[in-house]
């Protein structure tokens, strides 16, 4: 705890001090005081440099004195034999004695008192910039008129800060300009303009005279301009050394004028004004600017429109133009937006066709769709070539953005049917000869695939089972083969409205309109063993003449078996209807006259015993297309017959083309469209 005074005595004083002692006293007086230390008695063993016994006085790191021997006062009126005056408030006194004393020494008696120090004069460094005032225990600084004392309570300066200039034009000068500026001051001026305007400072060389730089080039007095993170200056010297026109690119400018204690000059004067912030005329590729101007400034708005085939993508939305505003910071809004080539994206896939992975999906790229040939062809034309259009769609010259449609090729077997060894009036066949052949397992019968979703068959096949199970793609109807083939699931059966439904179908004598359509749940995938047969055209070219040849196929009854294991086929000629009428019905269920013969029936067969039989019903009587010899069309459907191995009757499909087309159209699905 600091004290104002105190006494220090050597050990055992006034008796002799002991040997081998080291003792120290830390003296502390209050802040703002010095210490006056004086000895009234000194009797310590004398030695050179007081090396044996001594009393040492230390101030900080400085040894103020080292005492030994005997002293007496020079002044009869004063008891002081030695004294020290330090301008600090702390002092250390250390007493040391060695291991032996030749005589008896009594040591010392000392006293200290706190004394006032004159901070204004006692130190090399003057504590105040202008006036220094001492008082007991301290000092204070004061300033001349028009100066004020800074927060450090030591330095005086003029009150030249705090001015904020908001007008778009103005003039600022150093204090007292053109008289000498005050020393030891820091003047800060702020220019704050509305956002969107930049501060432009103009000076004349002759309006600037500030104390010059020292030999190292450092300004002693300086003028600095700070605009955001940009700094102009420091400037000093006679005549303004910087640019006479300073474009700050900022609406906020701080002017800092710093002076030292010496060398006052006349100072400086400047003008400023606010310029609307300019925005650069940027080069935005693949676009045009509207309006086009040589210079754009704050608040200007331009519409940037992409050239055809380019778009601006923001998020997931594509647009052909955007607006950009010259902002207060001198930057364009929406500057990240760019006109990029339109991307049409990965082209949509199509059923039963493919599109090669394009190298590019950008504007101008070309892709080609192809159908899975030879089983599908492009129905809606257009050649399959699409280019990436400016609107971001893949476009075909004929179809526009509509996708090509791959539809099954009809009537073309993968392998032509060749009559081999004759088996029961027919030959072994392969499903590839008759890829349209459909097998019905209950009742055992046939049908003809006419497109992806539809099977044509005889009405009498499905009248008793409206949910038939059908198979395609297999030559053999052995269980193991059917398990590997494609099973077709019906969605709905459509029997011709002219077909008369009977309570006892076994006794039927009227097979007029023996035709039905089965709509499938799922589309059939075409291939070498599954492919549709064509329908007849409506022109007279498709009117059959006697002797025209047609092919029949099926797994019906043969001479050896009730049901064929593998597909059988035969080539039959068309015969006059009377030939069928003339054959005696094998197992008549009524009078021969009761059997109905109509123009909706085709009579065929009678040659080499080739005929269709029980189990072949619903299969196609396939005839070569008169207008395209590579194709077959379903001229007839196996319907009924008087006797196997003679002549058979077939539903004349040409008479039902309108009904077939209407039924399919009315019962198509969006998928199919």
């Amino acid at each position: 705890e600091p004290t104002m005074y105190g006494e220090i005595l050597s050990p055992n004083y006034p008796q002799a001090y002991p040997s081998e002692v080291e003792k120290s006293w830390d003296i502390e007086v209050p802040e703002g005081y010095g210490i006056h230390l004086y000895f009234t008695h000194l009797d310590i063993e004398l030695s050179e440099n007081c090396a044996y016994d001594s009393v040492q006085i230390i101030s900080g790191d400085t040894e103020e004195g080292r005492l030994c021997g005997q002293r007496s006062s020079n002044n009869p009126h004063s008891p002081i034999v030695e004294e020290f005056q330090v301008p600090y408030n702390k002092l250390q006194v250390i007493f040391k004695s060695d291991f032996s004393n030749e005589e008896r020494f009594t040591g010392f008696a000392a006293y200290y008192v706190a004394t006032d120090i004159n901070e204004c004069t006692d130190f090399v460094d003057v504590p105040c910039s202008h006036f220094c005032n001492n008082f007991i225990g301290g000092y204070f600084c004061s300033c001349p008129p028009e100066y004020f004392l800074h927060d450090d309570m030591k330095n005086c300066g003029v009150n030249c800060s705090g001015d904020v200039f908001t007008a778009l034009i103005g003039e600022i000068a150093s204090p007292n300009y053109p008289k000498p500026y005050p020393e030891n001051s820091r003047c800060e001026y702020q220019i704050r303009l509305e956002k969107g305007f930049q501060v432009v400072v103009t000076l004349r060389r002759e309006d600037f005279d500030v104390e010059a730089a020292d030999s190292a080039g450092n300004c002693l007095d300086s003028l600095v301009f700070v605009a955001g993170d940009r700094q102009f200056g420091p400037y000093c010297g006679h005549g303004f050394p910087g640019p006479l026109n300073i474009e700050t690119k900022s609406n906020a400018l701080d002017i800092i004028f710093q002076t030292d204690l010496t060398g006052q000059k006349k100072g400086w004067k400047l003008r400023y004004h606010g310029d609307p912030m300019p925005c650069p005329k940027e080069d935005t590729p693949n676009s045009v600017w509207e309006p086009a101007k040589a210079k754009y400034v704050f608040r200007d708005v331009v519409q940037i429109t992409c050239l055809d085939g380019f778009e601006v993508v923001e998020g997931r939305v594509g647009a052909t133009s955007f607006y950009s505003t010259c902002q207060s910071n001198g930057k364009w809004s929406n500057s990240k937006l760019k006109c990029q080539p339109v991307d049409c994206g990965i082209p949509e896939s199509i059923e039963n066709g493919k599109v090669e992975d394009p190298e590019s999906t950008l504007f101008g790229s070309v892709i080609r769709y192809t159908c899975e040939e030879p089983y599908y062809y492009m129905e809606n034309g257009g050649g399959g070539e699409y280019h990436c259009a400016g609107n971001g769609s893949w476009v075909n010259e004929v179809l526009g953005p509509e996708l090509p449609k791959c539809v099954p090729v009809c009537g073309v077997p993968r392998e032509p049917f060749e009559e081999k060894q004759r088996i029961i009036g027919g030959s072994d066949a392969d499903i590839k000869n008759f890829p349209w052949q459909v097998f019905f397992d209950n009742p055992w019968a046939g049908g003809a695939l006419i497109n992806e979703y539809w099977v044509l068959t005889a009405a009498h096949v499905v009248e008793g089972n409206r949910e038939p199970t059908m198979y395609v793609g297999s030559t053999s109807v052995q269980t193991s083969r059917l398990a590997k083939s494609k099973m077709l699931t019906p969605e709905h059966v459509f029997i011709h409205p002219g077909w008369k439904l009977l309570e006892v179908p076994e006794g039927r004598t009227n097979f007029d309109n023996d035709i039905a359509l089965v709509r499938l749940k799922d589309p059939v995938k075409m291939g070498p063993t599954v492919s549709p047969i064509c329908l007849p055209g409506t022109s007279s070219d498709y009117n059959l003449m006697d002797g025209d040849l047609g092919l029949i196929s099926g797994w019906g009854r043969t001479e050896k078996r009730d049901r064929a294991v593998r597909l059988k086929a035969a080539r039959l000629p068309v015969a006059p209807l009377r030939k069928c009428k003339e054959v005696k019905v094998e197992k008549p269920t009524a009078d021969a006259e009761a059997y109905v013969f109509t123009p909706n029936m085709i009579c065929a067969g009678g040659e080499k015993g080739m005929d269709s039989c029980k189990g072949d019903s619903g299969g196609a009587f396939a005839v070569q297309d008169p207008n395209d010899k590579t194709k077959f069309y379903a001229a007839g459907l196996v319907s009924w017959g008087p006797q196997c191995g003679t002549y058979g009757l077939y539903t004349r499909v040409k008479n039902y083309v309108d009904w077939i087309m209407k039924t399919m159209q009315e019962n198509s699905t969006p998928r199919e469209d």
Partner: antibody
């Protein structure tokens, strides 16, 4: 009427081979697919394999692969099944069976041939 | 090869009972499943094919159902002639396989 007539019972020693025949009458072998099935005494039915005329290949159950050979002589309408490296657990009745149509797996069964493997 | 698992292995029932036998395939076999009845010393007799189609001449008290991997054979009212062993058989893959059998015996 189609019939399958199998060869008579056989007694074989372990390690030996047995060849069972199955003659088709009333139809031609080319129109049929012949399968072979066996049944050990008091045990279940085991499908052994078949000749697939469509693919022209013989398919065997994995269990018998490498030990069984199925052949056909179309001139005599006879099918054969030969099993080699016989062991006691091969003692069983061996049936030839024709494949059915339109989902029916087996149509016609032979009368069966008992093969006994005993040392 | 596809594994066929029948349950139960043995079933004790009385005349007139409704009996259900289950067959599970190790992978989907669609509806390519048949059920056979076998009596001692006789060749198996086909009851059901394609999972639910009744073979001609088989009494209507026998019925089959299921598709994919789960199948059942049901005898609606057990008759004295029905005490036998029943097998399921898959014919989806060309490597056909049988179940291990279910013996239906008199309770």
């Amino acid at each position: 009427q189609v019939q399958l007539v199998q060869s008579g019972a056989e007694v074989k020693k372990p390690g030996a081979s047995v060849k069972v025949s199955c003659k088709v009458s009333g139809d031609t072998l080319t129109e049929l697919s012949m399968h072979w099935v066996r049944q050990a005494p008091g045990k279940g039915l085991e499908w052994m394999g078949t000749f697939d005329p469509e693919e022209g290949e013989t398919i065997y159950a994995q269990k018998f692969q490498g030990r069984v050979t199925m052949t056909e002589d179309t001139s005599t309408d006879t099918a054969y099944m030969e099993l080699s490296s016989l062991r006691s657990e091969d003692t069983a009745v061996y049936y030839c069976v024709t494949e059915g149509l339109a989902g029916v797996p087996f149509d016609l069964w032979g009368q069966g041939t008992l093969v006994t493997v005993s040392s | 090869d596809i594994q066929m698992t029948q349950s139960p292995s043995t079933l004790s029932a009385s005349v007139g009972d409704r009996v259900t036998i289950t067959c599970r395939a190790s992978q989907s076999i669609s509806s390519w499943l048949a059920w056979y009845q076998q009596k001692p010393g006789k060749a198996p007799k086909l009851l059901i094919y394609k999972a639910s189609s009744l073979e001609s001449g088989v009494p209507s008290r026998f019925s089959g159902s299921g598709s994919g991997t789960e199948f059942t054979l049901t005898i609606s009212s057990l008759q004295p002639d029905d005490f036998a062993t029943y097998y399921c058989q898959q014919h989806n893959s060309y490597r056909w396989t049988f179940g291990q059998g279910t013996k239906v015996e008199i309770k």
